[in-house]
């Protein structure tokens, strides 16, 4: 059998609503005919299944064979280092993946100019492989907030940060001018879920926005 | 320091109309923006509408959008909110509010700084 393979020193998932992908960290002098295989195991059904005889990436989108993840009591992956007719010991995740460890995130943010009011509006991801009943919104029901920052430009650069609880929010600039940009990240109050900060939205406010038009 | 007085609540059939006063104790131009925000039993005050005071332009939440109307009568110091088309969801105190500045931006309670007292508006089906 010769040398033994090491196992890959760590296993962990990374995921999105919708976008499960299982990372490893590389075995130490590995070759260029080493690939990894992985393999994932549905609690309450307690046999592991495999995904992956040889990938060569450091990291395999499990996405498509976890999505009643949001429905299930979680899962574990392990994966194993392959060259030729070796192969290292398994290495597992070390936690359970559930709908806890999935980071939230927001699909965009719209912002319009209404009399002078910036009207902003939080869009919720529309992942393509989500089954057409688990929409963001019917999955994280209730106790949704939104942290949101503003800055303006010109000015101190300092943000301003609020919670709202609606898809919905609108700003009161007191008439000044200028580049609003907003950020938005995403929680649940119920739920113990990381948000990731979206990218910044900005939008140009000038004098011609504040004149009446009601 | 300005003082908030609302007037104008009170009882009315859904499908009616009321029209509430909030009376500034100090011109209008000296505050940026008067909002009227409402409040239910067990939830939070949220806003319902907003006006700028040195443009009169102004912003409604969905939920009231083409049935409530605020205004401002700068010579008396006063804001309005006209209310049609009431529906029991409706029922609520609502509240003045008034701000001079605001560097918090968001069209939400704690940028406020001035409140009345409030005055009950309930609508019955």
């Known amino acids: 059998h010769g040398t033994e393979l090491p196992s890959p020193p760590s296993v962990w998932f990374e995921a999105e609503f919708f976008h499960h992908i299982l990372h490893w960290t590389p075995i130490p002098n590995q070759s260029e005919s080493t690939c990894y295989e992985v393999a994932l195991l549905r609690y309450g059904i307690e046999s592991w299944n495999s995904i992956s005889n040889c990938s060569q990436t450091l990291s395999y989108d499990l996405t498509a064979v976890t999505l009643d993840l949001y429905h299930s009591n979680g899962y574990r992956a392990r994966v194993r280092a392959v060259d030729g007719s070796r192969h290292s010991n398994w290495t597992v995740t070390n936690t359970r993946f559930s709908v806890d460890e999935v980071t939230l995130t927001v699909g965009s943010v719209n912002l319009e100019i209404h009399n002078g009011f910036i009207l902003g509006k939080i869009q919720l991801p529309r992942p393509k492989m989500a089954p057409a009943n688990d929409t963001y919104e019917s999955i994280f029901s209730h106790f949704r907030e939104y942290e949101i920052a503003i800055r303006k430009v010109p000015g101190n650069f300092t943000f301003t940060h609020k919670k709202v609880k609606h898809e919905n929010f609108s700003l009161l600039t007191s008439g000044e001018v200028g580049e609003f940009c907003v950020q938005v990240k995403p929680s649940v109050a119920s739920r113990s879920n990381k948000g990731m900060w979206s990218k910044e939205e900005c939008i140009s406010l000038t004098r011609q926005y504040f004149t009446v038009t009601n | 320091q300005v003082q908030l007085q609302e007037s104008g609540g009170g009882s009315v059939q859904a499908g009616g109309s009321l029209r509430l006063s909030c009376a500034a104790s100090?011109?209008?131009?000296?505050?940026?923006?008067m909002a009227w925000f409402r409040q239910s039993p067990g939830k939070e005050r949220e806003p319902v509408a907003v006006?700028?005071?040195?443009?009169?332009?102004?912003f409604y939440p969905d939920s009231v959008k083409g049935r409530f109307t605020i205004s401002q009568d700068n010579a008396k110091m006063t804001v309005y909110l006209q209310m049609n088309s009431l529906k029991s969801e409706d029922t609520a105190m609502y509240y003045c509010?008034?701000?001079?500045?605001?560097?918090?931006?968001?069209?939400?309670?704690?940028?406020?700084?001035?409140w009345g007292q409030g005055t009950q508006v309930t609508v019955s089906s």
């Open positions: 006006i700028y005071t040195a443009s009169g332009a102004t």
């Open positions: 509010a008034a701000v001079r500045k605001t560097d918090s931006y968001l069209f939400d309670a704690q940028s406020f700084t001035y």
């Open positions: 100090r011109y209008l131009y000296s505050i940026d923006y």
